[in-house]
């Protein structure tokens, strides 16, 4: 049915399928060193890995995409691993009047799925 | 900054970057012919194409991902083209008591971005 449960066991082997992974990045890596003051180093959770058939399908569209990719791989791409939710982060950054705090709620991934 | 505007012109040439494309699919293609009655053929809009640096970035996370992919391509994947919104679709399907209409909110893509 259109609401089949997404598959959660990876058929490709451990760590190969869509999952959350921590990537260390400095403000210089991000090109933010001129306006963000702190933290100097960010632990950025990102979504990496493959999306085999019906693995962690985000929704009905992703299930259809997986199916049609099997039928028409040149025309329809496989689903890919993207954030399903985010963790807010507070950054200290420069302002005209000094330093202020600002939250970013779309910066660090909290969970991943195949869309 | 973290809120740079997403780039909208495709540097790879016409039709190569992330966009919406219509894919024809029958109920048989989708494996739905045993429970969906109508429509027999669906025009499924799907997101296809590449996501070059900062093209149609979904959010701050996607911008970071694009940047880190440039620095660490083996560790951080490029953003990929996924739906940003959906168009509701009404399907007529079999039930125990006969036939009913049901709306699916997450079946057909309406817009795309790079996440």
């Amino acid at each position: 049915s259109a609401h089949a449960h997404p598959r959660d066991s990876c058929p490709l082997g451990p760590g190969r399928c869509c999952h959350l992974e921590t990537v260390q990045a400095t403000l210089e890596d991000l090109g933010w060193s001129d306006w963000v003051l702190s933290p100097r180093q960010l632990q950025l959770s990102m979504c990496v890995g493959e999306c085999p058939h019906l693995y962690r399908s985000a929704n009905t569209h992703a299930q259809i995409k997986a199916r049609l990719h099997g039928l028409q791989p040149d025309k329809v791409p496989a689903p890919c691993c993207v954030p399903s939710s985010y963790t807010p982060v507070v950054l200290m950054h420069r302002t005209d009047s000094g330093v202020s705090l600002q939250t970013y709620d779309d910066l660090v991934a909290r969970g991943c799925h195949c869309a | 900054s973290a809120h740079a505007h997403p780039r909208d012109s495709c540097p790879l040439g016409p039709g190569r970057c992330c966009h919406l494309e219509t894919v024809q699919a029958t109920l048989e293609d989708l494996g739905w012919s045993d429970w969906v009655l109508s429509p027999r053929q669906l025009q499924l809009s799907m997101c296809v194409g590449e996501c070059p640096h900062l093209y149609r970035s979904a959010n701050t996370h996607a911008q970071i991902k694009a940047r880190l992919h440039g620095l660490q391509p083996d560790k951080v994947p490029a953003p990929c083209c996924v739906p940003s919104s959906y168009t509701p679709v009404v399907l007529m399907h079999r039930t125990d008591s006969g036939v009913s209409l049901q709306t699916y909110d997450d079946l057909v893509a309406r817009g795309c971005h790079c996440a």
């Epitope: 003051l37 702190s38 933290p39 100097r40 180093q41 632990q43 963790t87 807010p88 982060v89 507070v90 950054l91 200290m92 330093v99 705090l101 939250t103 709620d105 660090v108 | -």
Partner: antibody, heavy 119, light 110 residues
């Protein structure tokens, strides 16, 4: 084991100055922000401000701006909260707290320093 | 007056389930996570729940958090005498940064 150890209780007179401390151990002191929180007798928690010990950047709650100074000495993994001229209304328990990884919550707290200001 | 509103007190008998609410607005709870702290009598606050519904290691699973819209709640099941404490919610507010609720005193009856 992460620990924040604060200096002992203080009894002061109005108009006097004071500097209390918070020493971090069991983690990389410069990798986490330190915040200060006030709790007046019988009352709730109030956020006063935050410092990034690595660069000594400070941000204050509007309610405490100009009333206190937050500083840090990263060479001895210690953060400070100071007053140049105490008032009776500064009588309270003061806590230092370490910020969690993404800066949205306080994951470890000091035991508190009780400051009593009375003539 | 706290930016986040909590009931001043709640009570329950041992073994019961109690909930503590925390009401905010679209400029705080509505946009960011809620965290909960437990302050046992005469001690420093301790992180109980972070990011709406996550427990730090060592916190019993009798404690759980949830958030809906501009409100959050802390639930404690199988109430025990040692749960008697003050409980504070905390979030972020765009105007005053880190904000706490006024605190709720939990009394375990009997």
């Amino acid at each position: 084991e992460v620990q924040l150890v604060q200096s002992g209780a203080e009894v002061k007179k109005p108009g006097e100055s004071l500097k209390i401390s918070c020493k971090g151990s069991g983690y990389s002191f410069t990798s986490y922000w330190i915040g200060w929180v006030r709790q007046m007798p019988g009352k709730g928690l109030e956020w006063m401000g935050v410092i990034d010990p690595s660069g000594s950047y400070t941000i204050y709650s509007p309610s405490f701006q100009g009333q206190v100074t937050i500083s840090a000495d990263k060479s001895i993994s210690t953060a400070y909260l100071q007053w140049s001229s105490l008032k009776a209304s500064d009588t309270a328990m003061y806590y230092c707290a370490r910020y969690g990884r993404y800066g949205t919550y306080f994951d470890y707290w000091g035991q508190g320093t009780l400051v009593t200001v009375s003539s | 007056q706290s930016v986040l509103t909590q009931p001043p007190s709640v009570s329950g008998a041992p073994g019961q389930r109690v909930t503590i609410s925390c009401s905010g607005s679209s400029s705080n709870i509505g946009v960011l996570y809620v965290n909960w702290y437990q302050q046992l009598p005469g001690t420093a606050p301790k992180l109980l729940i972070y990011s709406n519904d996550n427990r730090p290691s060592g916190v019993p699973d009798r404690f759980s958090g949830s958030k809906s819209g501009t409100s959050a709640s802390l639930a404690i099941t199988g109430l025990q005498a040692e749960d008697e404490a003050d409980y504070y919610c905390q979030s972020w507010d765009s105007s005053s940064n880190y904000v706490f609720g006024g605190g709720t005193k939990l009394t375990v009856l009997g």
